[in-house]
Interface confidence: low
């Protein structure tokens, strides 16, 4: 998730006062809009155990950041799971990552001031073929 | 366990807290980390045996604009041979974010804030089989 | 195959105004970030503009920053840099290149143009 | 901004030769950098990226290793066509850098 340039064409009666990008500092409804899906992937789905390249979800539970738990994969093996409930060594399982979005507190501990902080989250595995280097 | 909510902490309120209107919190858009970069393995949405293509959301009324999603090529998996093998399946995998929505009313903006859910990318399971009694 | 083949560039005079312009064709496009890497004479390589796949993202060095602007045109499969205000440090061969990641930016460059001259001299 | 600096700048060496190069970086980068290799009058081309990981159809006798801010380029035989100027560019942050080259030229 990077910078967002954005510019919206803007009512014509309206007052000029309104910066046409979003301002650095905005007050925001403290209902947050799809608040209540549910945040833990074990109960959403077993895909990390159903997968050829499975994963473990660990904890990691932060107060002073909304969301304060996160859940994060790691990849169980190096290779991928075979028909026959086996490591195959020949695949590579390999975490899917992708960045967010959280609410960090800012100044810490402040009920209602917050700072939009980028993190990375290993988000499940996938089964890839390797990249192989034939030598010259 | 519910999600606590966003106003609530573990902590003392310190003295130095900005002053906040009623049911609104102050939020900085200026994003920490802003410029720190994740260093990607090459094409693995191409590699999987689940793989799957991307497209951009784009929306000028939300922050950031721009929303990357996922959708899987296959509903089964790629096998050995190239070849997509129907008894297994591709699944997305999802992941939440957080972004701030604009909204006009006739003059007036106001910011909400939003989960989005993103398809990340796609996995390779083994189906479940519900047998018939 | 993947080809960006650059052009616009040309002598102008300091304060001057210069568009380059980047075709590019064998690929998807608008799937890419696409970047301006400069190189003056004899010197080494500057990063100098970033556009994301829909050019809602862009990213400048200081030394550009409010002289050049990138764009973009997916439906003409082409890349632009507008360059103002143009000094003598601005000389240099100015190359367009392609992110090696689909749609997510991996921020290295698999695949460069031949390069097109600006010199800046009054 | 990020500096990166290579090292040397400049080296002789003949074919069949190892041929180590250095890039370090001003803080830490993680394994996010990238080695390109120049030739006179061409554009540059992706050799190496995160830090070790082979560009396709670049020859496996260069290798590149290291993490957080100690990098290194070698071409564990040189051949005539490696003979050129060498780049590290660091991925970690806005501005991207490059480092400001080693050229290898044939003793």
């Known amino acids: 998730i990077v910078k967002a340039g954005i510019t919206i064409p803007r009512n014509p009666g309206c007052p000029n006062s309104e910066d046409k990008n979003f301002p650095r500092t905005v007050m925001v409804n403290l209902n947050i809009h799809n608040r209540n899906t549910n945040t833990n992937p074990k109960r959403s789905s077993d895909y990390y155990n159903r997968s050829t390249s499975p994963w473990n979800l660990h904890r990691n539970e932060d107060p002073e950041r909304y969301p304060s738990v996160i859940w994060e994969a790691k990849c169980r093996h190096l290779g991928c799971i075979n028909a026959d409930g086996n490591v195959d060594y020949h695949m590579n399982s390999v975490p899917i990552q992708q960045e967010i979005l959280v609410l960090r507190r800012e100044p810490p501990h402040c009920p209602n001031s917050f700072r939009l902080e980028k993190i990375l989250v290993s988000v499940g595995c996938t089964c890839v073929t390797p990249i192989v280097h034939h030598v010259a | 366990r519910k999600i606590p909510k966003v106003g609530h902490t573990f902590f003392q309120k310190p003295e130095s807290c900005p002053p906040v209107p009623g049911g609104s919190m102050k939020l900085d858009i200026g994003i920490i980390n802003e410029n720190q970069r994740v260093s990607m393995s090459r094409n693995i949405e191409s590699r999987s045996t689940s793989p799957w293509n991307y497209t951009v959301t784009w929306d000028p009324n939300r922050y950031p604009s721009e929303v990357v999603q996922a959708q899987c090529r296959n509903l089964g998996c790629i096998n050995a041979q190239g070849k997509e093998d129907i008894s297994m399946n591709s699944v997305p995998i999802q992941q939440e974010t957080l972004v701030v929505r604009r909204k006009h009313q006739g003059c007036s903006v106001s910011f909400q804030l939003e989960k989005v859910l993103v398809t990340v990318g796609c996995t390779c399971v083994t189906p479940v089989i519900h047998h018939v009694q | 195959q993947v080809q960006l083949v650059e052009s616009g560039g040309g002598l102008v005079k300091p304060g001057g105004s210069l568009r380059l312009s980047c075709a590019a064709s064998?690929?998807?496009?608008?799937?890419?970030?696409m970047t301006w890497i400069r190189q003056a004479p004899g010197k080494g390589l500057e990063w100098i503009s970033y556009?994301?796949?829909?050019?809602?993202?862009?990213y400048y060095a200081d030394s550009v920053k409010g002289r050049f602007t990138i764009s973009r045109d997916n439906a003409q499969n082409s890349l632009y840099l507008q360059m103002n205000s143009l000094r003598a440090e601005d000389t240099a061969v100015y190359y367009c290149?392609?992110?090696?990641?689909?749609?997510?930016?991996?921020?290295?460059?698999?695949?460069w143009g031949q390069g097109t001259t600006v010199t800046v001299s009054s | 901004a990020i500096q990166l600096t290579q090292s040397p700048s400049s080296l002789s060496a003949s074919v069949g030769d190892r041929v180590t190069i250095t890039c370090r970086a001003s803080?830490?980068?993680?394994?996010?950098l990238a080695w390109y290799q120049q030739k006179p009058g061409k554009a540059p081309k992706l050799l190496i990226y995160?830090?070790?990981s082979l560009e396709s159809g670049v020859p496996s006798r260069l290798s590149g290793s290291g993490s957080g801010t100690d990098f290194t380029l070698t071409i564990s035989s040189l051949q005539p066509e490696d003979f050129a100027t060498y780049y590290c560019?660091?991925?970690?942050?806005?501005?991207?850098?490059f480092g400001g080259g080693t050229k290898v030229e044939i003793k």
């Open positions: 064998g690929f998807t496009f608008s799937n890419y970030y």
């Open positions: 560019q660091q991925f970690n942050s806005y501005p991207l850098t």
């Open positions: 556009i994301s796949s829909t050019g809602g993202n862009i």
């Open positions: 290149a392609r992110d090696g990641g689909v749609i997510i930016s991996t921020a290295m460059f698999d695949y």
């Open positions: 803080q830490g980068i993680s394994s996010a």
């Open positions: 995160d830090a070790s």
